[in-house]
């Protein structure tokens, strides 16, 4: 099923690499581009008898258009007013310039040995779990060469069975990997949770009447810092995959090769158990740094956080994130409005449906309107 | 936890075909051959062959090449196995199950299949 | 084909006795060798793997052992709630083969 989330950066990306073009690029939006993106993600989908799918597909298009136009104009309004938004709150934080900067500082500290141990683990976690990866598949390769020495009668016959165990547990070892792995990034989202809330409460007295504006730039912060987690999560589960994509062909060079002399079996048995040793090891050496590196982007965005609030602010491009998490409030908005419709439709008679779908145009016009409006 | 779950029992004529579903839920469905194993009263077990649900792969024991094809289907974690030109040797049941570690460790209840005319 | 013989069709023993099956090979298989009980009216269910790993749930009177071509799978004291059929099987080598079972009754 196509998921809000897969949607709202299919258009996220597609902005970001038109506003990174000319600026021409933006006012002559390429609606059939954006709408050719939208329509790959529905194409599997659409092979089974799928009326879900073609009917969220039929209105999501024209929305996502509409609202892909809205996000272009109101990009540098957007701008303005977070510049604004940062002004006031700068100014009702200068008094108390040195105590907030060191809030966020103890902040900071806490945040980094609140995630240390993750990183640690997720480390420890990756290093056992390649290490038992190795092992659950190196006793097939040794296995599948003692029956070859062996000169079993038809090695088709009693080689084959080892191959088939090796393919299938290099499928399950490598769910497994993940299943153990990506926790950690949900665990991540709840300590981003616990450190933002901590610091919202600490910086509160000195925010005062700007208490809302202050909220606004936590929650942009809360955003940036769980989409980072999103991306370790998957990066993660990417680098899992190409293992298993690297590991998958050993298997079948092993069964393609039984068909053939036995010289290249020989060959392709002997050389086995050095290629598993040499990918699962290549995994390790290049996912064991994730957590470090994620814990040092989570740090940074903090640090820029004090730099906004600070009284030396430079001219920062915080307002994307903002826009970026207003597409996906809408996006997700969408969803779940169209979700709602969608089993209310089960039960609607035809000329109540009607008037349902007339209705529900004006939302979709509506749901459109102006993102993040703020108060000035 | 680990589930397989079966169609119901058949009772078709002789030279006909019929289609087996197993249902499977609680794991990794791709990743596990599934096996298909033939139960008559007083011939004991016969192993059939087993899918690949990841690609469709298959391997079948020489015996049943021919008369048993297996599939899957990602999608609805749903194993298959089609019994063609039945005869009355085909009555039996049939168990779909999941092989791990060169055995078969969870099974479904069975479908009893009857050839009759 | 790998023929796995299971001399003994049937068996009799008492609750609280010690009773063993065994299973040859025709051939060597290693350790990849399962037993399997099967209750009347039921679906077969795995007791034992690797030729002596007890499977997730199996009571620890169950017991395997063996390698090469002859396994041994002991009840260390049979209970009623063992009535069954217990198959072995091996899986080394296609096809997979299993053998004809022995029925175990209760006195």
């Known amino acids: 099923e196509v998921s809000a989330d897969q949607v709202a950066t299919v258009m996220w990306d597609y902005f970001s690499q038109l506003s990174n073009n000319a600026k021409e690029a933006v006012e002559h939006l390429q609606k059939s581009e954006l709408t050719q993106q939208l329509n790959a993600l529905f194409q599997d989908k659409l092979g089974e008898v799928n009326t879900y799918a073609g009917d969220l597909q039929k209105k999501l298009v024209p929305f996502a258009t509409e609202l892909h136009e809205r996000l272009a104009k109101d990009s540098e309004k957007l701008k303005e007013e977070i510049g604004k938004e940062l002004e006031e709150l700068r100014a009702r934080l200068l008094p108390h310039a040195n105590e907030v900067s060191q809030k966020i500082g103890d902040n900071l500290r806490e945040l980094q040995q609140r995630l240390e141990p993750y990183a640690d683990q997720l480390r420890t976690q990756v290093s056992t779990q390649a290490e038992q990866l190795r092992r659950q598949l190196t006793p097939y390769a040794q296995r599948m060469e003692r029956v070859l020495r062996e000169n079993a009668d038809s090695l088709q016959a009693s080689l084959r069975p080892h191959a088939d165990e090796l393919k299938a547990k290099i499928d399950q070892n490598v769910e497994e990997l993940k299943g153990r792995l990506t926790p950690y990034a949900d665990e991540f989202k709840v300590k981003i949770d616990q450190t933002v809330e901590e610091l919202r409460r600490s910086l509160a007295p000195y925010a005062q009447d700007t208490q809302e504006k202050l909220n606004h730039q936590l929650e942009g912060l809360t955003f940036q810092m769980k989409k980072n987690a999103e991306e370790l999560k998957a990066r993660i589960s990417a680098s899992a995959e190409e293992l298993r994509q690297r590991l998958a062909p050993l298997a079948e060079d092993v069964r393609g090769n039984l068909r053939g002399n036995t010289e290249g079996l020989q060959k392709s048995l002997a050389e086995l158990g050095g290629h598993l040793d040499q990918q699962v090891e290549e995994f390790r050496r290049r996912v064991e740094p994730y957590g470090e590196n994620f814990n040092k982007a989570l740090v940074q965005q903090m640090e820029q956080l004090r730099q906004k609030l600070g009284p030396h602010a430079g001219d920062v491009e915080g307002h994307l994130s903002f826009l970026e998490k207003d597409l996906r409030d809408k996006v997700n908005s969408f969803f779940s409005t169209f979700k709602e419709k969608e089993s209310q439709d089960k039960t609607l008679s035809l000329p109540e449906l009607e008037q349902q779908q007339e209705q529900q145009q004006e939302q979709q016009q509506e749901q459109v309107q102006m993102l993040a409006p703020l108060e000035s | 936890q680990v589930q397989l779950q079966q169609s119901g029992a058949e009772l078709v004529k002789p030279g006909a075909s019929v289609k087996i579903s197993c249902k499977a839920s609680?794991?990794?469905?791709?990743?596990?051959?599934m096996s298909w194993v033939k139960q008559r009263p007083g011939k004991g077990l016969e192993w059939i062959g087993q899918?690949?649900?990841?690609?469709?792969?298959?391997y079948y024991n020489g015996k049943f090449r021919g008369k048993a094809t297996l599939t899957a289907d990602k999608s609805s974690s749903t194993a298959y196995m089609q019994l063609s030109s039945l005869t009355s040797e085909d009555s039996a049941v049939y168990f779909c199950?999941?092989?791990?570690?060169?055995?078969?460790?969870?099974w479904g209840q069975g479908t009893s299949l009857t050839v009759s005319s | 084909d790998i023929v796995m013989t299971q001399s003994h069709k049937f068996m009799s023993t008492s609750v609280g006795d010690r009773v063993s099956f065994t299973c040859k090979a025709s051939q060597a298989v290693g350790s990849a060798v399962a037993w399997y009980q099967q209750k009347p009216g039921q679906s077969p269910k795995l007791l034992i793997y690797?030729?002596?790993t007890r499977h997730t749930g199996v009571p620890d009177r169950f017991t395997g052992s063996g390698s090469g071509t002859d396994f041994t799978l002991t009840i260390s004291s049979a209970q009623s709630a063992d009535l069954a059929d217990y198959f072995c099987?091996?899986?080394?080598?296609?096809?997979?083969?299993f053998g004809g079972g022995t029925k175990l009754e209760i006195k």
């Open positions: 199950a999941r092989r791990d570690n060169y055995c078969l460790d969870f």
């Open positions: 099987q091996q899986c080394s080598t296609y096809p997979c083969t």
């Open positions: 899918v690949y649900p990841g690609d469709g792969d298959t």
């Open positions: 690797w030729a002596s």
């Open positions: 609680g794991y990794a469905f791709s990743s596990y051959w």
